[in-house]
């Protein structure tokens, strides 16, 4: 049975040419966590194994920053960039979790973060 | 197993620069942010910042962002730490130290700097 | 920035004695960024726990670490000679990441 839960930063806005901190955290599970991957809609972002550190896109090897932790920083944001992302913990033996971010990417400068939720 | 090398100790006079290294090897050096730390007795242990190898990305602490300058060589697998304007708050012993899974896992031996006048 | 508060600043323990020290955050940090190190005397420093209550590699069973939110502590149950170090907690939760001040674990 599944018993972890995932944090995320929730919804959130930054402004465009600025950077942003994607954030998960995985609770309430012993389950060893092996690999985290960082989706767009469909694109693979990055991936951070417990072996083999980061990996990032070639495509977004210029705008994203591994780090603080399993998080990831997007830099040089534009307004292309607003939309869903994913982390996907692989863990085990519990299998896997996900969790759901929702950035929009502001053009003015009134970006404010949203509150933090929890998706079981 | 990895293993991060720093360069010897170094004095300096004050008002200069001075550039120390971290080699790093036992690992992928291009898949781990590198962070230096600064530990002095009064001050304990600083986070200067990190540089992720792999595309050159830094983030600072801003207390140190107009006097230390992170660089990586990847054909080296080796990280640098500039400081400049030296005074004697500088003095100090700076740690270089990869990040592993969730921690620092991996110190290099560290780096005395002494600062004179 | 985190402050991180520890307490206390210097301990004295006996051989077998089971000693903690605390950890106090300014605000809210997950455990999965909260760390500990050992740093003995003209050394580098060593971690000993990670994600607040996770053992490192190699790191003897008789420490363990607990803790949630803005609090943190790392016990010693039966204190050793080899223990005798200075610890260090740390958080990652965000930038720049802190260090606390130490706890220096003296042995009677």
């Known amino acids: 049975m599944m018993t972890g839960t995932i944090e995320t930063t929730g919804n959130i806005s930054a402004e465009k040419g600025g950077s942003i901190i994607l954030q998960c955290h995985l609770s309430s599970t012993t389950a060893q966590v092996t690999q985290v991957n960082w989706e767009q809609q469909d694109q693979l972002l990055a991936i951070c194994n417990a072996d083999l550190g980061w990996h990032i896109s070639p495509s977004f090897k210029d705008r994203v920053a591994p780090g603080p932790g399993l998080g990831l920083t997007l830099q040089s944001l534009t307004v292309n960039d607003t939309g869903e992302y994913f982390c996907i913990y692989h863990t085990y033996p519990d299998g896997t979790y996900t969790g759901r971010i929702f950035l929009e990417v502001l053009e003015s400068s009134v970006a404010e973060h949203g509150a933090r939720f929890q998706i079981p | 197993q990895a293993y991060l090398q720093q360069s010897g100790a170094e004095l300096v006079r004050s008002g200069a620069s001075v550039k120390m290294s971290c080699k790093a090897s036992?690992?992928?050096?291009?898949?781990?942010?590198m962070h230096w730390v600064k530990q002095t007795p009064g001050q304990g242990l600083e986070w200067i910042g990190k540089?992720?190898?792999?595309?050159?990305?830094?983030d600072y602490n801003q207390k140190f962002r107009d006097k230390a300058t992170l660089t990586a060589d990847t054909s080296s697998s080796t990280a640098y730490m500039q400081i400049s304007s030296l005074t004697s708050e500088d003095s100090a012993v700076y740690f270089c130290?990869?990040?592993?899974?969730?921690?620092?896992?991996?110190w290099g031996q560290g780096t005395t700097l002494t600062v004179s006048s | 920035d985190i402050v991180l508060t520890q307490s206390p600043a210097i301990m004295a323990a006996s051989l077998g004695q089971k000693v903690t020290m605390t950890c106090s955050a300014s605000s809210s940090v997950n455990s999965t960024y909260f760390h500990w190190y050992q740093q003995k005397s003209g050394a580098s420093p060593k971690t000993m726990i990670h994600r607040s209550s996770n053992l490192a590699s190699g790191v003897p069973a008789h420490f363990s670490g607990s803790g949630s939110g803005t609090s943190d502590s790392l016990t010693i149950s039966s204190v050793e000679a080899d223990d005798d170090a200075t610890y260090y907690c740390h958080q990652w939760s965000g930038y720049p990441f802190t260090f606390g001040a130490g706890t220096k674990l003296e042995l009677k």
């Open positions: 130290t990869r990040e592993g899974w969730l921690s620092l896992g991996y």
């Open positions: 036992g690992y992928t050096f291009t898949s781990y942010n």
């Open positions: 540089i992720f190898p792999g595309n050159g990305f830094t």
